[in-house]
Protein backbone atom coordinates (compact mmCIF):
# COMPACT_ATOMS: atom_id res chain seq x y z
CA UNK A 1 0.00 0.00 0.00
CA UNK A 2 2.60 2.55 0.86
CA UNK A 3 4.81 1.78 -1.66
CA UNK A 4 2.87 2.15 -4.46
CA UNK A 5 1.18 5.42 -3.28
CA UNK A 6 4.76 6.66 -2.77
CA UNK A 7 5.69 5.57 -6.10
CA UNK A 8 2.42 6.69 -7.60
CA UNK A 9 2.66 10.04 -6.36
CA UNK A 10 6.24 10.69 -7.26
CA UNK A 11 5.66 10.11 -10.64
CA UNK A 12 3.38 13.39 -10.97
CA UNK A 13 6.01 16.28 -12.02
CA UNK A 14 5.98 19.09 -10.00
CA UNK A 15 2.77 20.94 -12.39
CA UNK A 16 1.05 17.96 -13.25
CA UNK A 17 -2.23 17.78 -12.01
CA UNK A 18 -5.09 14.95 -12.51
CA UNK A 19 -7.09 17.48 -15.17
CA UNK A 20 -3.60 18.57 -16.95
CA UNK A 21 -3.16 15.18 -17.48
CA UNK A 22 -6.88 14.53 -18.66
CA UNK A 23 -6.89 17.14 -20.67
CA UNK A 24 -3.42 16.47 -22.52
CA UNK A 25 -4.14 12.56 -23.11
CA UNK A 26 -5.13 12.27 -26.52
CA UNK A 27 -7.98 9.17 -25.02
CA UNK A 28 -9.91 7.94 -22.88
CA UNK A 29 -7.74 4.58 -23.11
CA UNK A 30 -4.68 6.42 -22.78
CA UNK A 31 -5.78 8.62 -19.61
CA UNK A 32 -6.80 5.00 -18.00
CA UNK A 33 -3.12 3.18 -19.57
CA UNK A 34 -1.30 5.54 -17.51
CA UNK A 35 -2.78 5.28 -14.46
CA UNK A 36 -2.23 1.67 -14.73
CA UNK A 37 1.48 1.91 -15.34
CA UNK A 38 1.87 4.73 -12.74
CA UNK A 39 0.51 2.42 -10.20
CA UNK A 40 3.31 0.11 -8.94
CA UNK A 41 5.64 0.42 -11.49
CA UNK A 42 8.06 -1.94 -11.75
CA UNK A 43 10.36 0.43 -13.91
CA UNK A 44 13.67 2.37 -11.87
CA UNK A 45 13.68 5.22 -14.07
CA UNK A 46 10.03 5.69 -12.31
CA UNK A 47 9.83 4.54 -9.01
CA UNK A 48 14.07 4.13 -7.86
CA UNK A 49 15.11 1.01 -6.61
CA UNK A 50 13.10 0.04 -3.57
CA UNK A 51 14.08 -3.17 -1.16
CA UNK B 1 -8.53 8.87 -32.53
CA UNK B 2 -5.04 9.03 -33.02
CA UNK B 3 -3.72 7.91 -36.66
CA UNK B 4 -0.51 7.08 -38.34
CA UNK B 5 0.79 6.90 -41.79
CA UNK B 6 3.92 6.19 -43.13
CA UNK B 7 5.68 7.99 -46.57
CA UNK B 8 8.87 7.11 -48.53
CA UNK B 9 10.57 5.25 -51.82
CA UNK B 10 9.49 1.48 -51.70
CA UNK B 11 13.04 0.99 -53.53
CA UNK B 12 16.41 2.13 -52.48
CA UNK B 13 20.27 1.43 -53.77
CA UNK B 14 22.61 -0.15 -51.39
CA UNK B 15 24.85 2.24 -49.74
CA UNK B 16 22.35 4.72 -50.44
CA UNK B 17 20.22 6.49 -47.62
CA UNK B 18 16.87 5.41 -46.85
CA UNK B 19 14.83 8.15 -45.49
CA UNK B 20 10.79 7.69 -44.54
CA UNK B 21 8.45 10.09 -42.70
CA UNK B 22 5.23 8.69 -40.64
CA UNK B 23 2.70 11.64 -40.77
CA UNK B 24 0.48 12.17 -37.16
CA UNK B 25 -2.83 12.91 -37.60
CA UNK B 26 -5.43 13.47 -34.22
CA UNK B 27 -2.24 14.05 -31.92
CA UNK B 28 0.74 16.02 -31.50
CA UNK B 29 4.30 14.84 -31.45
CA UNK B 30 4.85 17.41 -29.11
CA UNK B 31 2.76 15.86 -26.46
CA UNK B 32 5.23 14.96 -23.65
CA UNK B 33 3.27 11.89 -22.82
CA UNK B 34 3.99 10.66 -25.76
CA UNK B 35 7.01 8.59 -27.77
CA UNK B 36 7.20 8.06 -31.01
CA UNK B 37 8.76 4.90 -32.38
CA UNK B 38 10.37 3.30 -36.18
CA UNK B 39 10.23 -0.61 -36.14
CA UNK B 40 11.18 -2.87 -39.02
CA UNK B 41 9.92 -6.08 -40.08
CA UNK B 42 12.40 -7.88 -42.72
CA UNK B 43 10.57 -10.97 -45.03
CA UNK B 44 9.28 -13.70 -43.00
CA UNK B 45 10.92 -12.35 -39.62
CA UNK B 46 10.12 -11.07 -36.63
CA UNK B 47 9.57 -7.24 -35.55
CA UNK B 48 13.03 -5.23 -34.71
CA UNK B 49 12.89 -1.95 -32.83
CA UNK B 50 14.86 1.03 -34.76
CA UNK B 51 14.49 4.34 -32.67
CA UNK B 52 12.07 6.88 -30.73
CA UNK B 53 11.88 10.45 -30.94
CA UNK B 54 10.07 12.63 -27.83
CA UNK B 55 8.01 15.76 -27.43
CA UNK B 56 11.48 17.83 -27.00
CA UNK B 57 13.24 16.10 -29.77
CA UNK B 58 15.66 13.67 -27.94
CA UNK B 59 16.11 10.81 -29.30
CA UNK B 60 17.11 6.98 -28.47
CA UNK B 61 18.23 4.39 -31.12
CA UNK B 62 18.62 0.33 -30.74
CA UNK B 63 22.35 -0.08 -29.76
CA UNK B 64 22.51 -2.24 -32.80
CA UNK B 65 21.38 0.43 -35.17
CA UNK B 66 22.50 3.67 -33.66
CA UNK B 67 25.53 4.25 -35.80
CA UNK B 68 23.53 4.32 -39.29
CA UNK B 69 19.92 5.57 -37.63
CA UNK B 70 19.05 9.14 -37.17
CA UNK B 71 15.46 10.12 -36.40
CA UNK B 72 14.64 13.78 -36.34
CA UNK B 73 11.20 15.68 -36.54
CA UNK B 74 8.99 18.40 -38.65
CA UNK B 75 6.63 19.82 -35.82
CA UNK B 76 4.72 22.44 -38.22
CA UNK B 77 3.72 18.98 -40.41
CA UNK B 78 3.53 17.33 -37.26
CA UNK B 79 5.92 14.56 -39.14
CA UNK B 80 8.73 12.38 -37.45
CA UNK B 81 11.16 10.76 -39.66
CA UNK B 82 13.28 7.59 -40.51
CA UNK B 83 17.31 8.14 -41.99
CA UNK B 84 19.05 4.43 -42.24
CA UNK B 85 22.38 4.77 -43.91
CA UNK B 86 24.45 2.38 -46.19
CA UNK B 87 21.79 0.45 -46.56
CA UNK B 88 22.16 -3.22 -47.75
CA UNK B 89 19.87 -5.55 -48.71
CA UNK B 90 19.24 -7.31 -45.31
CA UNK B 91 17.79 -3.95 -44.97
CA UNK B 92 14.67 -4.93 -46.93
CA UNK B 93 11.42 -4.93 -44.61
CA UNK B 94 8.32 -3.33 -44.02
CA UNK B 95 8.33 -0.31 -41.58
CA UNK B 96 6.37 0.40 -38.88
CA UNK B 97 6.29 4.01 -37.46
CA UNK B 98 4.15 3.84 -34.09
CA UNK B 99 3.47 5.47 -30.66
CA UNK B 100 2.96 4.95 -27.09
CA UNK B 101 2.88 6.21 -23.58
CA UNK B 102 5.58 8.26 -21.96
CA UNK B 103 5.13 8.50 -18.38
CA UNK B 104 6.48 10.63 -15.41
CA UNK B 105 9.73 11.83 -17.62
CA UNK B 106 11.40 9.27 -19.07
CA UNK B 107 9.75 5.87 -18.56
CA UNK B 108 8.52 4.16 -22.00
CA UNK B 109 5.91 1.87 -22.02
CA UNK B 110 4.05 0.16 -24.77
CA UNK B 111 3.03 0.55 -28.41
CA UNK B 112 -0.45 1.17 -28.68
CA UNK B 113 -0.57 2.79 -32.13
CA UNK B 114 0.99 1.60 -35.24
CA UNK B 115 0.88 2.69 -39.04
CA UNK B 116 -0.15 0.16 -41.52
CA UNK B 117 3.84 -0.13 -42.44
CA UNK B 118 5.59 0.82 -45.83
CA UNK B 119 7.22 -1.96 -47.70
CA UNK B 120 11.29 -0.68 -48.42
CA UNK B 121 13.33 -3.09 -51.12
CA UNK B 122 16.76 -2.51 -50.92
CA UNK B 123 18.21 -3.60 -54.01
CA UNK B 124 20.17 -2.50 -57.37
CA UNK C 1 21.68 -6.27 -24.44
CA UNK C 2 18.55 -7.53 -22.83
CA UNK C 3 16.92 -10.70 -25.20
CA UNK C 4 13.34 -12.55 -25.01
CA UNK C 5 13.19 -16.01 -26.03
CA UNK C 6 9.74 -16.55 -27.90
CA UNK C 7 9.05 -20.97 -28.85
CA UNK C 8 8.38 -20.81 -32.84
CA UNK C 9 5.20 -22.22 -32.50
CA UNK C 10 1.78 -23.40 -30.71
CA UNK C 11 -0.82 -25.55 -31.80
CA UNK C 12 -4.22 -25.24 -29.95
CA UNK C 13 -7.35 -27.40 -30.41
CA UNK C 14 -10.68 -25.23 -31.11
CA UNK C 15 -12.01 -23.99 -27.62
CA UNK C 16 -9.14 -24.84 -25.97
CA UNK C 17 -6.27 -22.77 -24.10
CA UNK C 18 -3.35 -22.06 -25.45
CA UNK C 19 -0.10 -20.49 -23.54
CA UNK C 20 2.42 -18.48 -25.11
CA UNK C 21 5.63 -18.34 -22.78
CA UNK C 22 8.36 -14.80 -23.26
CA UNK C 23 11.66 -16.02 -21.51
CA UNK C 24 13.87 -13.41 -20.35
CA UNK C 25 15.89 -12.90 -17.37
CA UNK C 26 14.17 -11.64 -14.52
CA UNK C 27 11.47 -10.64 -16.64
CA UNK C 28 9.52 -9.80 -13.93
CA UNK C 29 11.29 -6.50 -12.97
CA UNK C 30 9.65 -5.30 -16.28
CA UNK C 31 6.83 -4.52 -17.58
CA UNK C 32 5.61 -7.22 -20.09
CA UNK C 33 3.51 -6.19 -23.46
CA UNK C 34 1.91 -8.73 -26.11
CA UNK C 35 0.67 -8.21 -29.80
CA UNK C 36 -1.04 -9.91 -32.55
CA UNK C 37 0.15 -9.57 -35.95
CA UNK C 38 -2.25 -11.13 -38.56
CA UNK C 39 -0.54 -11.61 -42.54
CA UNK C 40 -0.35 -8.70 -44.35
CA UNK C 41 -1.34 -6.45 -41.11
CA UNK C 42 0.38 -4.45 -38.37
CA UNK C 43 0.62 -5.76 -34.93
CA UNK C 44 -2.13 -5.04 -32.48
CA UNK C 45 -1.64 -4.42 -28.65
CA UNK C 46 -3.27 -7.22 -26.58
CA UNK C 47 -1.81 -7.41 -23.53
CA UNK C 48 0.18 -4.04 -21.53
CA UNK C 49 1.90 -3.93 -18.32
CA UNK C 50 1.48 -7.50 -17.79
CA UNK C 51 -1.93 -8.33 -17.73
CA UNK C 52 -4.42 -5.83 -18.67
CA UNK C 53 -6.48 -5.49 -21.75
CA UNK C 54 -6.70 -2.60 -23.82
CA UNK C 55 -10.07 -1.60 -24.68
CA UNK C 56 -11.41 -4.03 -27.75
CA UNK C 57 -9.69 -7.13 -26.93
CA UNK C 58 -11.71 -9.81 -25.77
CA UNK C 59 -11.40 -11.32 -22.30
CA UNK C 60 -10.55 -14.40 -23.24
CA UNK C 61 -6.80 -12.79 -23.76
CA UNK C 62 -4.80 -12.91 -20.05
CA UNK C 63 -1.30 -12.66 -19.40
CA UNK C 64 0.66 -12.75 -16.46
CA UNK C 65 4.43 -12.03 -15.66
CA UNK C 66 6.45 -14.00 -13.02
CA UNK C 67 10.59 -15.03 -12.23
CA UNK C 68 11.82 -15.49 -15.80
CA UNK C 69 8.88 -15.84 -18.03
CA UNK C 70 6.21 -13.86 -18.63
CA UNK C 71 2.85 -16.13 -20.26
CA UNK C 72 -0.13 -15.16 -22.53
CA UNK C 73 -3.04 -17.20 -22.02
CA UNK C 74 -5.59 -17.37 -24.69
CA UNK C 75 -8.95 -19.11 -23.12
CA UNK C 76 -11.01 -20.36 -25.61
CA UNK C 77 -9.14 -20.03 -28.71
CA UNK C 78 -10.84 -18.70 -31.35
CA UNK C 79 -10.13 -19.32 -35.05
CA UNK C 80 -9.15 -15.40 -35.22
CA UNK C 81 -6.94 -15.95 -32.85
CA UNK C 82 -4.29 -17.78 -35.32
CA UNK C 83 -1.52 -15.28 -35.74
CA UNK C 84 1.93 -14.11 -34.83
CA UNK C 85 2.13 -13.31 -31.04
CA UNK C 86 4.82 -10.88 -30.03
CA UNK C 87 6.43 -10.06 -26.28
CA UNK C 88 8.27 -6.75 -25.61
CA UNK C 89 9.86 -5.26 -23.05
CA UNK C 90 11.89 -1.53 -22.79
CA UNK C 91 15.42 -2.12 -21.41
CA UNK C 92 15.71 0.54 -19.39
CA UNK C 93 19.43 -0.09 -19.17
CA UNK C 94 19.60 0.75 -22.58
CA UNK C 95 16.53 2.96 -23.18
CA UNK C 96 15.53 0.54 -25.99
CA UNK C 97 12.79 -1.42 -26.65
CA UNK C 98 13.04 -5.19 -27.22
CA UNK C 99 10.48 -7.79 -29.29
CA UNK C 100 10.90 -11.42 -28.35
CA UNK C 101 11.20 -13.45 -31.70
CA UNK C 102 7.42 -13.93 -32.23
CA UNK C 103 5.68 -17.33 -31.85
CA UNK C 104 2.57 -18.44 -34.38
CA UNK C 105 -0.68 -19.74 -32.90
CA UNK C 106 -2.31 -22.66 -34.86
CA UNK C 107 -6.05 -23.07 -33.87
CA UNK C 108 -7.11 -26.71 -34.83
CA UNK C 109 -10.36 -28.06 -36.12
Known amino acids: GNLKHKCFRNSLENNETLESIMNTLESEEDFRKYFYYLEGSKDALLCGFST | EVQLQESGPGLVKPSQTLSLTCTVS??????????SSWIRQPPGKGLEWMGV???????YYSPSLKSRTSISRDTSKNQFSLQLSSVTPEDTAVYYC????????????????WGQGTQVTVSS | SYELTQSPSVSVALRQAAKITCGGDNIASKHAHWYQQKPGQSPVLVIYKDSNRPSGIPERFSGSNSGNTATLTVSGAQAEDEADYYCQVWDSSANAAVFGGGTHLTVLG
Open chain 2, 98 to 113: ARGLRVAGSYFTDFGT
Open chain 2, 26 to 35: GGSITNSYYA
Open chain 2, 53 to 59: IIYDGST
